[in-house]
């Protein structure tokens, strides 16, 4: 018997992937479990095997098609089940009707690059990956810059309240190594959350010009 809590959480990346995590306090690590997806208006069913990610949680990705294909819409409902093997049969452990566009988590932004760097400022651009065309411009971003001697957690968050895939970082210190990350979130969806942070982009500001003797 499981004495603690259990939780089944899934997110749709807006294109062709539903990522799920099943956690259960006190469950056996070697239990074989899977997630089954049954859409209300599609011909396909999909299953993925839950694999351990920590002592009491398992994760898997339901791959619905090619990465950039639009497999679900705002009107779709997908019934998701967690099934675990008990002896010779599969037992339902959790169930929910999943509204994909109410539970969004996009892929991390990609292709970060320094467009222009000076002594005190740096212009950086990026791209969003596998994001639905349904969003049009209804996205927001958060960015953070890692300064020497600090941690990512200490870095102040810069918020871009529109679909702006670039930023100009100001008031930087000359000849200094920095790292930069960005994440994205659609405005749509009651349970929508931020994407993972992008891979960090390392850059260095230019040294200050040497003063001339007078």
């Amino acid at each position: 018997a499981v004495n603690g809590t259990s939780q089944f959480t899934c997110f749709y990346n807006s294109r062709a992937n539903i990522s799920c995590v099943w956690s259960q306090d006190g469950a056996l690590q070697d239990t074989s479990c899977q997630v089954h997806a049954w859409p209300d208006r599609r011909r396909w069913n999909q299953t993925c095997e839950l694999l351990p990610v920590s002592q009491a949680s398992w994760a898997c990705n339901l791959i619905l098609g090619a990465p950039d294909s639009q497999k679900l819409t705002t009107v779709d409902i997908v019934t998701l089940r967690v099934l675990c093997r008990e002896g010779v049969r599969w037992r339902v452990m959790a169930i929910q009707d999943f509204k994909p566009f109410e539970n969004l988590r996009l892929m991390a932004p990609i292709s970060l690059q320094v467009v222009h760097v000076e002594t005190h400022r740096c212009n950086i651009s990026w791209e969003i990956s596998q994001a639905s065309h349904y969003f049009e411009r209804h996205l927001e971003f958060e960015a953070r810059t890692l300064s020497p001697g600090h941690t990512w957690e200490e870095a102040p968050l810069l918020t871009l309240k529109q679909k702006q895939e670039w930023i100009c970082l100001e008031t930087l210190t000359p000849d200094t190594q920095y790292e930069f990350q960005v994440r994205v979130k659609p405005l749509q969806g009651e349970f929508t959350t931020w994407s993972p942070w992008s891979q960090p982009l390392a850059f260095r500001t230019k040294p200050a010009a040497l003063g001339k003797d007078t």
Partner: nanobody
Framework: QVQLQESGGGLVQAGGSLRLSCAAS????????MAWFRQAPGKEREFVGA????????FYADSVEGRFTISRINDKNTVYLQMNSLKPEDTAVYYC??????????????????WGQGTQVTVSS
């Protein structure tokens, strides 16, 4: 906040049927998985079955599978438990419950946030 109120319990003979109702008020009913649990005298509360937000999906405890059926009518903010082929061991207080909005239904009572007061079902032999 969701308020739940069960009704329909009573005394029935073994082999008989009974239909319990659970009326919900408060938040949007159709956002919630709904479940039934029961507690017999001197025993722990046990999972009976659950139904998804639209009613597309259900699952049941082994002890009631094939005899009990959960259904819901979202327009009426009501979930039902149809109990057939009742046995004396089905005697218990039956509770309607729901997890937080958007959460999945599980077999674990710890995962449920909202509970009704319960309705007594007694099956005589």
């Amino acid at each position: 906040q969701v308020q739940l109120q069960e009704s329909g319990g009573g005394l029935v003979q073994a082999g008989g049927s009974l239909r319990l109702s659970c009326a919900a008020s408060g938040r949007t009913f159709s956002n919630y998985v709904m479940a039934w649990f029961r507690q017999a005298p001197g025993k722990e509360r046990e999972f009976v079955g659950a139904i998804t937000q639209t009613g597309r999906g259900t699952f049941y405890a082994d002890s009631v599978e094939g005899r009990f059926t959960i259904s819901r009518i979202n327009d009426k903010n009501t979930v039902y438990l149809q109990m057939n082929s009742l046995k004396p061991e089905d005697t218990a207080v039956y509770y309607c419950s729901a997890p937080r909005s958007g959460r999945a239904g599980t077999r674990n009572q710890m995962d449920y946030e909202y509970w009704g007061q319960g309705t007594q079902v007694t099956v005589s032999s």
